[in-house]
């Protein structure tokens, strides 16, 4: 299982750091169902 380290805001996932609980300011659509940016 992945080791979660949210003190740093990062999760260790298969030896790779990825920011999971992302800032709502992220334009990548990390929040399920939240409309982000304009439709391209």
């Amino acid at each position: 299982d992945a080791e979660f380290r949210h003190d740093s805001g990062y999760e260790v996932h298969h030896q790779k750091l990825v920011f999971f609980a992302e800032d709502v300011g992220s334009n990548k659509g990390a929040i399920i169902g939240l409309m982000v940016g304009g439709v391209v």
Epitope: H6, D7, V18, G29, I32, G33, L34, V36, V39, V40
Partner: antibody, heavy 112, light 111 residues
Framework: QVQLVQSGAEVKEPGASVKVSCKGS????????VHWLRQLPEKGLEWIGR????????IYTPKFQDKATLTVDTSTDTAYMELSSLRSEDTAVYYC?????WGQGTLVTVSS | DIVMTQSPLSNPVTPGEPASISCRSS???????????LYWYLQKPGQSPQLLIY???HLASGVPDRFSSSGSGTDFTLKISRVEAEDVGVYYC????????FGQGTKVEIK
């Protein structure tokens, strides 16, 4: 009209695999993460994982790590989820989600 | 896994009256960055789910302001100030502090 259109219902035997598609219509699927969730009959929602179509990076819930494989074909604006080694417990409606758009859901029934 | 527990599981409501749903997480969803990673979704009958509230108290686009959400790090409440017929369905709380997990759902129906 902007929408995500999923492939139709599937009936599979235990042990088989199934590949569900999610096509962006009026929507560039490359721009945002594509999430996949499932809803068991008369039950709640489970998050399977997500893929970043830009680079193919995936994150899975541990229980789906060996069950689901997420891919994207950016040339056709289509995301895919393949489920392997199907069991009756995998009978569910599967949803794709990207930005504020949800697919209509695909019912996968596993039965012998 | 962070476990999300909702109550009640069924909530008969009267149109025009207020209603509330509770959700508890097995771990605090308040991150050191000040954000609380708690979400509310509604699944209307025969439809895909939709996002209502994100990061505990932010209303998603197009959601009527009769919906509101509040809470601490582990205890949360979704409130509907005046229930309308279109509000029926199953409400789910969810967290994404550590991946995503959902509550078991609360069915809201008209009395």
């Amino acid at each position: 009209q902007v929408q995500l259109v999923q492939s139709g219902a599937e009936v599979k035997e235990p042990g088989a695999s199934v590949k569900v598609s999610c096509k962006g219509s009026g929507f560039n699927i490359k721009t945002y993460y594509v999430h996949w969730l499932r809803q068991l009959p008369e039950k709640g929602l489970e998050w399977i994982g997500r893929i970043d179509p830009e680079n193919g990076e995936t994150i899975y819930t541990p229980k789906f790590q060996d069950k689901a494989t997420l891919t994207v074909d950016t040339s056709t604006d289509t995301a895919y989820m393949e489920l392997s080694s199907l069991r009756s417990e995998d009978t569910a409606v599967y949803y794709c989600v990207s930005s504020g758009y949800w697919g209509q859901g695909t019912l996968v029934t596993v039965s012998s | 896994d962070i476990v999300m527990t909702q109550s009640p599981l069924s909530n008969p409501v009267t149109p025009g009256e207020p209603a509330s749903i509770s959700c508890r997480s097995s771990k605090s969803l308040l991150h050191r960055n000040g954000k609380t990673y708690l979400y509310w979704y509604l699944q209307k009958p025969g439809q895909s789910p939709q996002l209502l509230i994100y990061q505990m108290d932010h209303l998603a686009s197009g959601v009527p302001d009769r919906f509101s959400s509040s809470g601490s790090g582990t205890d949360f409440t979704l409130k509907i100030s005046r229930v309308e017929a279109e509000d029926v369905g199953v409400y789910y709380c969810a967290q994404n502090l550590e991946l995503w997990t959902f509550g078991q759902g609360t069915k809201v129906e008209i009395k």
